[in-house]
Interface confidence: low
């Protein structure tokens, strides 16, 4: 404002200067300039007031915005806490549900296992029942046929590869054991292969057990006539030796399984366990 005023002063001085040089100044121009100066002042004042109003409005709005921001922040903070709580609650519920599901799962698995076991057990019983019925009807047929034909193994005998085997739990000398088997329409076991040997071993355990092999009448012979020389043999090393050193009189004329399954010749009067064998009829 001061500057404007100075300008006016300057204009006046200038006018005086012109007056001195050129004579009296034209009156309309001076009035025009004066009018122009007051308009500028008015404009300047208006702008200042407008600026003040704008500043006030902006300050007011800023204050409102700040309050709104604070409110938003508070709301967001509350929302975050609330959301966290909900997430925690859901997580806890999830864990609980997971545990319950695992519990249900394990219960179901156990029930399924039990059912499977029951089913297996039932199948086994059915199979056994069928086997028993078949065996019984077979025994009846054998009984009616006076034992001349046999298409199944007698009760308590074990079937293997078309033969029936009976394993003693008592002991007898070789001759007595052979007699027992004959009374059962069978004979002392004749071992014809490694497979049969293994089968017999599985059922006997490590026990001395008589077999149907003897040389009491000269050469070694199987009781059922199977050829000894060309057949399966499983002697212990250096056996048979017809040893006389036992002090029981005579040599050793009867064969038996030793504790590891291989054969040895021994005194026939020794009491050992024995195995009877009978062939099944071809009709089976």
């Amino acid at each position: 404002m001061t500057k404007d005023y100075q300008d006016f002063q300057h204009l006046d001085n200038d006018n005086d200067h012109h007056q001195l040089r050129r004579g009296p100044p034209p009156t309309p121009r001076l009035l025009q300039r004066l009018c122009s100066g007051s308009r500028l002042l008015l404009l300047s004042s208006s702008l200042s007031i407008l600026l003040l109003v704008v500043v006030c409005v902006i300050t007011s709005q800023n204050s409102q915005l700040r309050e709104d921001l604070l409110a938003l922040r508070q709301n967001f903070s509350n929302l975050t806490v609330s959301t966290e709580d909900q997430v925690k609650a859901l997580s806890t519920q999830g864990s609980s549900v997971g545990r319950k599901m695992k519990l249900v799962e394990s219960k179901l698995e156990k029930q399924q296992k039990d059912l499977t076991e029951d089913h297996s057990s039932l199948l086994l019983h059915v199979k056994q029942l069928v086997s028993d019925v078949r065996s019984l009807s077979c025994q009846m047929a054998a009984f009616r046929g006076n034992g001349s034909e046999r298409t199944c193994c007698p009760i308590n005998w074990v079937e293997y590869e078309g033969s029936c085997y009976w394993f003693s739990s008592s002991v007898r000398p070789w001759t007595e054991a052979d007699k027992y088997c004959q009374l059962e329409n069978a004979h002392l076991v004749v071992v014809t292969s490694r497979d049969e040997q293994n089968f017999l071993q599985r059922h006997m355990g490590p026990l001395n057990t008589w077999i149907g092999l003897t040389d009491q009448n000269g050469p070694w012979k199987w009781v059922d006539g199977t050829d000894y020389e060309t057949g399966f043999q499983n002697w212990r090393p250096e056996q048979p030796d017809n040893w006389y050193g036992h002090g029981l009189g005579g040599g050793e004329d009867c064969a038996h399984f030793t504790t590891d399954g291989r054969w040895n010749d021994d005194v026939c009067r020794r009491p050992y366990r024995w195995v009877c064998e009978t062939k099944l009829d071809k009709a089976n």
Epitope: P206, N208, T258, T259, D260, D266
Partner: nanobody
Framework: EVQLLESGGGLVQPGGSLRLSCAAS????????MAWVRQAPGKGLEWVSW????????YYADSVKGRFTISRDNSKNTLYLQMNSLRAEDTAVYYC??????????????WGQGTLVTVSS
């Protein structure tokens, strides 16, 4: 001279394990079947387990089946008895025994001095 020396006995809690060893000398070890026999305090001898000379065949008393394992290392002339899931009734002196001859599964001509196994909590 035939000698059998057991070791590995001791005090063990029920459910625990022990491994007994029997070092043999003075005879052709792999030519004979071997066995473990035990004697509980105030009781008679009880056969526990048997193994053939080649180690291929083994046999166990019903009371130890599934818990004890007999084995042998013929290159080291040693017999073993691995005892798992031990019970109080397994408390006894354990002897290793050499079979009398290959024809007699349960006859023994030489015994060790025994090793005491005590199962107690």
């Amino acid at each position: 001279e035939v000698q059998l020396l057991e070791s590995g006995g001791g005090l063990v809690q029920p459910g625990g394990s022990l491994r007994l060893s029997c070092a043999a000398s003075g005879f052709t070890f792999d030519g004979y079947d071997m066995a473990w026999v035990r004697q509980a305090p105030g009781k008679g001898l009880e056969w526990v387990s048997w193994i053939s000379g080649d180690g291929l065949n083994t046999y166990y008393a019903d009371s130890v089946k599934g818990r004890f394992t007999i084995s042998r290392d013929n290159s080291k002339n040693t017999l073993y008895l691995q005892m798992n899931s031990l019970r109080a009734e397994d408390t006894a002196v354990y002897y290793c025994a050499k079979q009398y001859d290959y024809e007699s599964a349960w006859r023994f001509d030489y015994w060790g001095q025994g090793t005491l196994v005590t199962v107690s909590s």
